[in-house]
């Protein structure tokens, strides 16, 4: 005889997951950033759409703008002027690339509750902001930067050789947008706006990448793009700043690139002011192993930035690429000259540096064999930063602030046990001077934001709690979810599974591995999320696995650097062992694997698919990488080096899934692309196909028109629901 | 609306010295640049100074370099030339004009005329 | 510094006529940094256009700016009576600011 369960009447009302849930975004959570506008000053636009300003010291909140305003040119985001006499109303979004957007901008001035007229700013416009003090705005339009004093003023015109897809000024072109910046802009404040730095990208000789896009017409459009892939032509960079206040006088000065970056091809990867008359630039070479952190000053009496050699300093990498994914950027200290960064210790795990004069006498602020993952702020006496070093769980991000005011300096865990349960992954933002904070906690709990005092980290007050998601899902049988990891061979495989809520240990099930393994990645993260997987293993009692193996991230330099130079081995590798391991563990059904990824973990499935193990029955390919040598310069020769013989070249020719044709022969394979991908170009699915085709090899296909690297909309729904269908056929699930 | 007035102006001996002012209103005086312009008696037009918002950096023409000196004072929305060691060439309409960006002028005050001569 | 030189000194028109004053620059004008003032005796100038072409706030179509380099042109579509007065070419590319020394349209 067994008990009769207590609340088994409750768990007959608890339903599973249903595709429709994840599609219509039921279970979706929110999170609350303040838009902070001075030390205890923040604003918020409410849920009928008001933006309020809200004052943590006297606790009072007023509406500086009605949602009647907003509504009256449909706008969908704003920004106050730092004097706030004004606020810039941003309507026409029209998304161009990942960051890039353009908008029609209206300036509405707080004082009279107008809008502002005359000299009305031109549309579209490609980015605008505000100075960081005062009221004077800087703009992209058509390529070209202009710069207003005071919103009704006549535009000054600080470039004028912007032309579209050759030359971008204050903007970056499509390869710095996507894979250096990574931003939509490419100008910047100097902190009492007196100077504007820019960037300004010269695409001439980049070969252009060209689409059809079939809208509605008679004939499709084509799209192109000046991008640069492996091996090719790339754009050339120069950085200029201007005295706003009085730019005319000398015009646009531009600053010096380091001698020993100059000498061959180079990027330019962040500019950062220090003080009005200070700024600090990074570059980097070609062969991405090599940065260089140039100060600068600047000269009064010539009116030009002066960059001395002793204000260089090298970061360079000679196991594999410099930094993780991007070089990490300088969080500079009071004394204007000295730096906080992270970069790799001497045991090969990155770690906060203070850097006063040289690298080499860098103090090492942080230690131990985990990372540190950013730095948010450091004031007069505390540098507040995450890592994952908590418990020794790479997966989690927890809020840390070392006191630098005293020696020795002291660490405490602002986060570690604030919900220990709920929170384990967390980021921050971060008033004037630390004064406030919030802290957005993404899980593995349902998320929160709370706002602290800079001081003391006590919790002031709770932001957002999702209690409407808390109540839907109180009658959802959400999967289970377990992180763990495997030791194989010296190397640490930590992976997530999702169990089917009545998982038994005893039974066999389906297992689907998803996968994006791309380096300086990280899929194994304590983060809450009810998705597709989660309705795959709820709904349709699929065990789905995540695993993070050689080339992830924030587990040192040997894990990460391992892939180096050799993309597409050791990431499927690591996923054919765990699957092994998977096995072994009893509860998986061997004759049902599958694996799934999207962008790198399209290139990574459709390998590991290819890899003749005879362990996948079937998988999916979304929007795949096939050959490296048809992806972006930037970012693969980060990895790879350059596609010559006296290179790479033949890792190039060795690692593309359509060498591997012949090895799909025994698999279910469906290979998914968009038609307008400006990212992944549809030309990497196109080969596979040929491939497969020319070696007389069965294979389901499906594009996407004129969608991109996203596939969102419409195609989403259609995309998951195609995609689900082809699982359960595969697994012989009934539908 | 914006207005710009000129006073000080008047009869000077070469190697004397006149302070003009410049009273500003209707517009955000602390935000701009400001410039001196002149024009002798049927001639044309001269730019003489310019002063940044805070006042930090000014400019001259060579022409009056080390004898004149340009200053604001915010909080009184005004702006002032110190002429010293005048010479008869300096005699002209001095305009006061709000300086978009060390570009352009506009807009201009009325003048102010100042006459040096024995 | 930059000498600007306008040209024709008067230009004798009628009202309703068709005004092109031209503006050459020693050196080129960096950036088509130029502006025109129109000016009525007895009075301040009057900002018409900077930027060698955008019209400031204010005034009318008739009048438009063109040019780069050395060579600048302003031109009057239709001119109205009170159009006629001195007009200055102003250049801000390069320091000292200078002014040309003007052009007078007249009452033919």
């Known amino acids: 005889l067994r008990p009769s369960r207590v609340h088994n009447s409750e768990e007959n009302t608890m339903r599973a997951l249903t595709l429709k849930d994840i599609l219509n975004g039921t279970f979706s959570y929110k999170t609350f950033f303040p838009n902070w506008i001075s030390g205890q000053e923040y604003l918020h636009q409410s849920a009928d759409n008001n933006i309020v300003l809200y004052n943590i010291e006297t606790g009072q909140s007023y509406t500086i703008l009605s949602n009647r305003t907003m509504k009256s040119v449909n706008a969908s985001n704003y920004g106050l002027s730092p004097d706030r006499q004004f606020v810039y109303l941003e309507s026409d979004y029209s998304k161009l690339w990942r960051y890039s957007y353009t908008a029609t901008y209206y300036i509405y001035d707080l004082s009279n509750g107008e809008f502002v007229r005359g000299n009305e700013l031109p549309r579209p416009i490609q980015y605008l902001c505000w100075s960081p003090v005062g009221s004077k705005l800087a703009y992209v339009y058509q390529n070209n930067i202009y710069l207003k004093q005071r919103p009704g003023d006549p535009p000054f015109q600080i470039t004028f050789n912007g032309r579209e897809n050759k030359i971008f000024n204050g903007i970056p072109d499509w390869v710095y947008e996507e894979e250096m910046l990574p931003t939509k802009y490419a100008l910047w404040w100097s902190p009492n706006g007196k100077f504007l730095a820019y960037a300004e990208f010269n695409d001439k000789d980049i070969p252009v990448i060209a689409y059809s896009y079939y809208g509605d017409e008679q004939y499709p459009r084509t799209i192109n793009i000046p991008y640069p892939k492996a091996g090719a032509k790339n754009p050339v960079v120069r950085i200029f700043i201007i005295d706003t206040t009085y730019p005319a006088y000398v015009g646009p000065q531009e600053v010096p690139v380091p001698a020993m970056i100059a000498s061959s091809d180079y990027y330019f990867s962040w500019l950062t002011w220090v003080t009005d008359e200070r700024v600090c630039l990074q570059w980097l070479k070609r062969v991405q192993n090599v940065s260089v952190l140039s100060i600068c000053d600047f000269r009064e009496d010539w009116q030009t930035w002066d960059c001395p050699k002793t204000q260089e300093h090298i970061e360079e990498s000679r196991t594999g690429w410099a930094g993780g994914f991007f070089v990490s950027r300088p969080v500079f200290s009071y004394d204007a000259i000295s730096y906080y960064k992270i970069f790799s210790d001497k045991d090969g795990y990155k770690h906060i540096h203070y850097i006063k004069d040289t690298v080499e006498n860098a103090i090492q602020i942080t230690s131990g064999k985990w990372e540190a993952i950013n730095i948010f702020r450091v004031t007069q006496d505390s540098l507040f930063y995450s890592s994952n070093e908590f418990e020794e769980y790479p997966g989690r991000r927890n809020i840390y602030r070392i006191s630098i005011g005293s020696y020795p300096p002291s660490k405490k865990c602002v986060t570690c046990h604030l919900r220990k349960e709920r929170c384990q992954y967390y980021t921050a933002s971060f008033s004037d001077y630390a004064k406030y904070y919030a802290l957005v906690c993404y899980g593995p709990g349902i998320p929160i934001s709370t706002l602290h005092d800079g001081r003391t980290d006590q919790e002031i007050k709770i932001l957002e709690e999702n209690k409407e998601l808390e109540n839907a899902l109180k009658n959802i049988q959400l999967p289970k979810e377990e992180i763990k990891k495997l030791e194989v061979d010296e190397i640490t495989l930590w992976y997530k599974m999702i169990l089917p809520p009545q998982f038994d240990r005893s039974k066999k099930y389906p297992l689907l591995i998803q996968v994006y393994g791309g380096p300086c990645s990280q899929s194994v993260r304590s983060v809450f999320a009810v998705n597709w997987i989660s309705y795959l293993a709820s709904k349709e009692g699929m065990v789905i696995a995540l695993v993070d193996g050689r080339g992830t991230a924030f587990q040192g330099d040997k894990l990460l650097y391992a892939v180096y130079r050799k993309l597409g081995v050791y990431e499927v590798e690591d996923q054919i062992t765990a699957v092994r391991k998977f096995i072994e563990m009893g509860f998986i059904d061997e004759k049902r694997i599958a694996i799934w990824g999207w962008s790198y973990g399209g290139y990574v499935s459709s390998l590991a698919l290819a890899s003749g193990t005879g362990l996948f029955k079937c998988g999916i390919a979304v929007a795949p990488v096939s050959s490296w040598e048809y992806y972006a310069s930037v970012y693969t020769e980060r990895f790879m080096g350059l596609p010559t013989k006296d290179d790479n070249l033949e890792h190039y020719k060795n690692s593309t899934v359509m060498a591997r044709a012949e090895y799909f022969r025994n698999v279910d394979y469906l290979l998914i692309h968009g038609t307008a991908d400006d990212n992944v170009h549809f030309q990497n699915s196109a080969q596979i196909a040929k491939a497969l085709v020319n070696a007389q090899v069965d294979f389901q296909a499906m594009w996407y028109s004129d969608q991109n690297h996203g596939l969102s909309g419409l195609s989403t729904n259609h995309l998951y629901t195609h995609m689900t269908h082809f699982l359960k056929q595969c697994f012989s699930l009934s539908d | 609306e914006v207005q710009l007035l000129e006073s000080g102006g008047g009869l000077v001996q070469p190697g004397g010295s006149l302070r003009l002012s410049c009273a500003a209103s209707g517009f955000t005086f602390k935000s701009y640049v400001m410039s001196w312009v002149r024009q002798a008696p049927g001639k044309g037009l001269e730019w003489v100074s310019a002063?940044?918002?805070?006042?930090?950096?000014?400019y001259y023409a060579d022409s009056v370099k080390g004898r004149f000196t340009i200053s604001r004072d915010n909080s009184k929305n005004t702006l002032y030339l110190q002429m010293n060691s005048l010479r008869a060439e300096d005699t002209a309409v001095y305009y006061c004009?709000?300086?978009?960006?060390?570009?352009?002028?506009?807009?201009w005050g009325q003048g102010t005329l100042v006459t040096v001569s024995s | 510094e930059i000498v600007l030189t306008q040209s024709p000194g008067t230009l004798s028109l009628s009202p309703g006529e068709r005004a092109t004053l031209s503006c050459r620059a020693s050196?080129?004008?960096?950036?088509?940094?130029l502006a025109w003032y129109q000016q009525k005796p007895g009075q301040a100038p009057r900002l018409l256009i900077y930027?060698?072409?955008s019209r400031a706030t204010g005034i009318p179509d008739r009048f438009s700016g063109s040019g780069s380099g050395t060579d600048f042109t302003l031109t009057i579509s239709r001119l109205e009576p009170e159009d006629f007065a001195v007009y200055y070419c102003q250049q801000y590319g390069s320091s000292p600011r200078t002014f040309g020394q003007g052009t007078k349209v007249e009452i033919k």
């Open positions: 930027g060698a072409s």
């Open positions: 002063i940044v918002p805070s006042g930090g950096d000014t």
């Open positions: 050196q080129s004008v960096s950036s088509s940094y």
């Open positions: 004009a709000k300086d978009y960006y060390g570009g352009w002028f506009d807009p």
